[in-house]
Structures are given as C-alpha cells and as structure tokens.
C-alpha cells in the first residue's frame, strides 16, 4: 500500500540498526572515495531526519522519495566535482535520470588499497571502545570496494563479524580465534560479492525476464516439491528483490527480502521440508539460511518429460498460447529433476528448447520436426560433464596453486593483451573451483564448478569492458550470460598477438620478496608466469615449468643466503639468462 | 540406444546376501531416477526401492532394513545390496532407469532363495 512518507516507512519497517547499515551502505556504493566519517555524517543526518518523518509524516520533505532524498545528500557534498569529476554532472539531472547516473558510475575495480586486517589486539581494543563504529567501518570498506554487494546479505556478514569478535577477543589467544574464523566470513563474503555481481549484470543486460528464468531454474531445484504456481511467485519476489538491491534501492530491498524469508516460513507445506531450522533463526541469519537451503527430497515418482514437451500433439498450441508460461514450466519441470546440472546449463537448454518450438511450430509437420529435441541437447549436456571432469582430474594432480598456474598460463594464452593484474586475479580466483567443488560428491560437482566460473568470468567482463583489449573477451563477453563460460572454455592461443619483448627488469627481483606472505609471493611468482606467456605465447608446458621450477629455487637459495640482497643481485641475472635460453 | 546391464543374481540360501548391479550405457542424459522392481512368479511386478539424482531413497515395506539401494553417478550404475535373504524374496528382479526422454526396462536377473 503507498504510505505518505516512505522514509518513515522503512525506518519503521526495518528498526534504526538496519537502517543505519543500509543507508550506510548505499552511500559507500554510490561513492565510493568519501572517507567514513564523511558518510557516517550524512547516514546520521538522513537518519535524525527519518525519525522526525516517523514522529510526524506530513512534517516538511517527508513525502519525497527515497532517491529524492539520498541523492539530494550525495549532491550537497562538498568538492564532489573535485574528487568525483564527471560524477558530479549527474546531480544536474532530476529523478528518475540522477539515480541512473550515479549507478552507471559505480566502479566495478576502485583504486582502493586493499582492505587490511588490524592485528588482533588492535582490532579487539577499537572493537571493545566502540562496536557500532567497529562494524560501521567494515560496511563502509566492504560496500565501496564491492558496489554491487547484497546489502541484506553485508548486514548478515557484519553480524557473523560482529559475533567473532565478541568470542575472540574474549580469549587468552586472540589471534589463533580471529584468523580462521575471519577468513572464513573473507572467503565466503568474496563468492557472494560476485554472485550478486552475477546477477546484477543479468538484470541490466538481458531484463527481468533473463534473472526470473535463472530464479525459477534455481527455486525448483532447491524445492522439487513445489508446484509450478508456487515456484513462479517466489521467482517473481526474489526477483523484485534483486532488482530493488541492484539498483540502489536498498531499503526496499532489505524490506521486501525480510517479507519473502517471512512468506516462505509461513508456507512450508507447499515449499519445502527443509525449512524449518532455517526458520527458527532471526532475521539476518534466517534469510540468508534460507538463500543457501539444501535441496528438499526429490519426488520419488516424477515422470519423464518428453509426454508434455515433445509427444504431446498440441505442444505448439500450448506454446503459442503462452510461451513463456510454457517455456517456464518447461524449465521448472527439467530443473527439478535435475539438482545435479548447472543453472546455466539448464538456461542452456531451455533457451535451445524455445528455439527449436520457434522454427518447428512454424513448419508444416511440427511434431516431426521437433521430434528429436531431446536428443539434440547432447553436445550441451557432454560439454560441461567434460570441463568439470578434465578439470577437476588437473586440480587433483597439481593442487590448487599448480591448478592456478595451469589456468594462468591457458587464459594469457586466450586473451594475452588483458593487464596481468587482471590475467593473475582471474586465474587465481577461476583455480579456488578446484578447492570449492572437485572435493564434492560427484552430482554435486557440475552446478558447483559452472556457476561459480560464471560468476568469475562475468567479473573478468566486467573489467574488460572498461578497458577493452582483446576481441576474443570482447566477442565472448557480449553475447548471452549463459554462453559466456563455453565461449571462454572455446578460445584457443590468440593468433592475432604480437609477443611482448623480453625485458630483463620485469624478471629482476629483490630480497624484500622473502618477507612476503605466501598468498603475495604466490602473485609475484603468478605475474611473472603471465608475464612469460605474454613473451612466449607458444611456450610448451614443459618449457614453462622448467623456468617456473628455476624460479622457484632461485627464490629458495636467496631467500636463505646470508647475504639476500648479493644473492639476489649476482643470481637474479643468470636466472634471466636460463630463462631466455630455456623458451629460446 | 540406452542398453542395461544387469548382473549379481542367483541361488543363495535363506540369511544370505547378494548384491545386484545394473550398469545404463548409451545415454545422454543422467538418469534422475534409478529403481528395481521384481516380480514372483504368478505375482504382480512390484517397486522394491528407487534412487533419484539427490540420493533419496525409497523401499518397498517388505525389505526396509534388509535392503540398500545405491548409485554411482559418474558410472551411471544402480546397485541393490540385499542382505537377509527370505524365501519370499525369490523373483526376477528387474532394473528400471529414467531420464528426461523416457524409462528403460533391464532384462531381468533371476534372484533364488532356498536352502
């Protein structure tokens, strides 16, 4: 129902906690440079200023709309041309078109420092002194290194954050609690930032209609046991939801999710049986229970499909009457009985479904021509099977650092013009697939391993556009979000690349590189690697892993020497001597 | 062509165990449902346990906690570990499979159980 002031709606609807985190994070996503404090004067100002609209709503700019309001904030900053440049031009627009500028000018890759981790004792004494603050800064570094991050989803890991801390920093050794349970909250926060990209990028490319399809894909998995009706109106409000959030709406969103965790827990019976223990938690911890519920039991007895969708005398009929209706129960009838196939690899096959009714329904014997559908989705379905088996038999050999270096060493030979910065993140995030799904069941391993490599992939995109280089990126990221993967998988060595010259300094390491953790030793070793390929694009894996190896014993010696810096500075040539003559 | 293996039947005396196995080939697909049925002579085939894609199970009342179906999913293969062995249990024991496209019906393996 319309309230007369929306402000005081959500404030009501959320509690001040939320609300504060929510707005906080709308604004370190919007901009992305402002310090804290700067935000966290303004969440407070909109927030005194919601709580006058809450005491009275007809009381002067209540009424105005939440962009209404946020932007006018965001515009009143000062020095925004300054720090924002072009930025600052959209506050010359008026709502809808302001809140569309300041999205298109969320930066995907902020030039940020990477977001440092406090020592424990210093992380526990600001922690201590002040909470609210504590946690007010991690949704702020978080949320303007990721603008796209799920807002409901930054408070569940600000209160997983939150609840660490409390026990940690309780304890005699503070660092051992705090390191692996912080890296674990790290670990899962980074997947669920490029998942949301994920679908974020859905939405604004392909429309709602593209995210609800992956929605019922997704829902009927998760609940094979729900009717048709049933899956179609929880796609629909998650849908809803992921739009609201993607596009900056985020107290909306946070609102609408808690009524659909809300809806599902009072639907059970006709969901799913998993529920409950999801149900029980409160809020944050129940929503997102409930985004990542296990599968509820298949029906024991579901028929095959091929009756309705390909035997069936009037399955054009049914299709011309409403295709999407059709399409989608299509869709909803495949994806439940088939828990083990990616998301993306059923769009994949709804979508050549579709296509096939679309040329048969228009022919003069239909039936015949659509006859062998099913069949035709056997180079679709191997595909996968294959990348995850081949894959996944390559992780178990090399490990997940060997595993990295192999994806290192094949994407700079797909696309060598992207900056190895951007090569090395990608290879070392597309080779954590390794030690995410390989160690699953195997029905568990195909939707584990593709959708997270779309995820990556879609981020790779997201980089590469800002900046295009290569056609061969270019050509796999504009075509369907759902091919992106197989396209990738399909490049080969770049023909087109002329090789980098060889230059001795990009090879030339010092003793500092000895004290560096191992993760940032690795990405040393990783861009040097990138760096070869770019030298050699048609270097042979053995020609590469004897220079890998001499690089790496190299690294030892010195890394051991008494004299480090000698070592580095009489050793450091010869090894860029052997490394010429080993690709030579 | 989708071609079924059965393999594992035999004579066993009552108390025994056997274990059936039904190895599918020549499909595209996974199968989402994986079963045996059986049937005695001059009785009606009957469902005696089904695996589906997510490893649910069910069984037929008369062999629960004697009876354990289970797959390999990367083999496409189906197993039946029959433990317990009762006269009545002697049937012909037939392996079923299901994908998108349609089921598929094994020969049938013949399973005795006498002292």
């Known amino acids: 129902e319309a309230h007369k002031s929306e402000i005081a709606h959500r404030y009501n609807d959320l509690g001040e906690q939320h609300f504060k985190g929510l707005v906080l994070i709308a604004f370190s996503q919007y901009l992305q440079k402002c310090s804290y404090d700067e935000h966290a004067k303004l969440v407070q100002e909109v927030t005194d200023f919601a709580k006058t609209c809450v005491a009275d709503e007809s009381a002067a700019n209540c009424d105005k709309s939440l962009h209404t309001l946020f932007g006018d904030k965001l515009c009143a900053i000062p020095n925004l041309r300054e720090n924002y440049g072009e930025l600052a031009d959209c506050c010359t627009k008026q709502e809808p078109e302001r809140n569309e500028c300041f999205l298109q000018h969320k930066d995907d890759n902020p030039s940020l420092p990477p977001f440092e981790r406090p020592e424990a004792e210093a992380m526990c004494t600001s922690f201590k002194e002040n909470p609210t603050t504590f946690m007010g800064h991690y949704l702020h570094e978080v949320a303007r290194r990721h603008p796209y991050f799920y807002a409901p989803e930054l408070l569940y890991y600000a209160e997983q954050y939150n609840e660490i801390l409390t026990q940690c920093c309780a304890e005699a050794d503070k660092e051992s609690c705090l390191t692996p349970k912080l890296d674990g909250v790290k670990e899962k926060a980074l997947v669920s930032s490029v998942r949301q990209r994920m679908k974020c990028s859905s939405m604004q490319k392909f429309g709602e209609r593209a995210f609800k399809a992956w929605a019922v894909a997704r829902l009927s998995q998760t609940f094979p046991n729900a009717d048709f009706a049933e899956i179609t109106k929880l796609a629909t409000d998650l849908t809803k939801v992921n739009k609201e959030c993607c596009h900056g709406d985020l107290l909306e969103c946070a609102d609408d999710r808690a009524e659909l965790a809300k809806y599902m827990c009072e639907n059970q019976a006709t969901i799913s049986s998993k529920l409950q223990t999801c149900c029980d938690k409160p809020l944050l911890k129940k929503a997102h229970c409930l985004s990542e519920v296990e599968h509820d039991t298949m029906p024991a007895d579901l028929p095959a499909i091929a009756a309705d969708f390909v035997e069936d005398q009037e399955v054009c009929k049914n299709y011309a009457e409403a295709k999407d209706v059709f399409l989608g129960t299509f869709l909803y009838e495949y994806s439940r009985r088939h828990p083990d196939y990616s998301v993306s690899l059923l769009l994949r096959l709804a979508k050549k479904y579709e296509a096939t009714l679309e040329k048969c329904c228009a022919e003069a014997n239909p039936p015949a021509c659509y006859g062998t559908v099913l069949a035709e989705f056997q180079p679709l379905v191997e595909e996968p099977k294959n990348l995850v088996k081949t894959n996944c038999d390559l992780y178990e050999k090399l490990g997940e650092y060997g595993f990295q270096n192999a994806i290192l060493v094949r994407y700079t030979q797909k696309a060598p013009q992207v900056s190895t910065p951007t090569l090395v993140e990608a290879a070392r995030n597309l080779g954590r697939v390794g030690t995410k799904c390989c160690t699953l069941p195997e029905d568990q391993r195909l939707p584990c391993v593709e959708d997270y490599l779309s995820a990556i992939l879609n981020r790779v995109c997201l980089l590469h556009e800002k900046t295009p280089v290569s056609e061969h990126v270019t050509k796999c990221c504009s075509g369907s979000l759902v091919e992106r993967r197989p396209c990738f998988s399909a490049l080969t060595v770049d023909e087109t690349y002329v090789p980098k010259e060889f230059k001795a300094e990009t090879f030339t390491f010092h003793s500092d590189i000895c004290t560096l953790p191992e993760k940032e030793k690795q990405i040393k070793k990783q861009t040097a690697l990138a760096e070869l390929v770019k030298h050699k694009p048609k270097a042979t894996a053995e020609q590469l892993k004897t220079v890998m190896d001499d690089f790496a014993q190299f690294l030892d010696t010195c890394c051991k020497a008494a004299d480090k810096d000698t070592c580095f500075s009489t050793e450091g040539p010869n090894l860029v001597t052997r490394c010429k003559d080993a690709l030579a | 062509q989708v071609q079924l293996q059965e393999s594992g039947g035999g004579l066993v005396q009552p108390g025994g165990s056997l274990r059936l196995s039904c190895a599918a080939s020549g499909s595209i697909f996974t199968f989402y449902r994986m079963a045996w049925y059986r049937r005695a002579p001059g009785k009606e085939r009957e469902l005696v346990a089904l695996?589906?894609?997510?490893?649910?199970?069910n069984y037929a009342d008369s062999v629960k906690g004697r009876f354990t179906i289970s797959r390999d999913y990367a083999k496409n293969t189906v197993y039946l570990q029959m433990d317990s062995l009762k006269p009545e249990d002697t049937a012909a024991y037939y392996c079923?499979?299901?994908?998108?496209?349609?089921?598929?019906w094994g020969q049938g393996t013949q399973v005795t159980v006498s002292s």
């Open positions: 695996i589906t894609t997510d490893t649910s199970t």
């Open positions: 079923n499979v299901r994908n998108v496209e349609r089921d598929y």
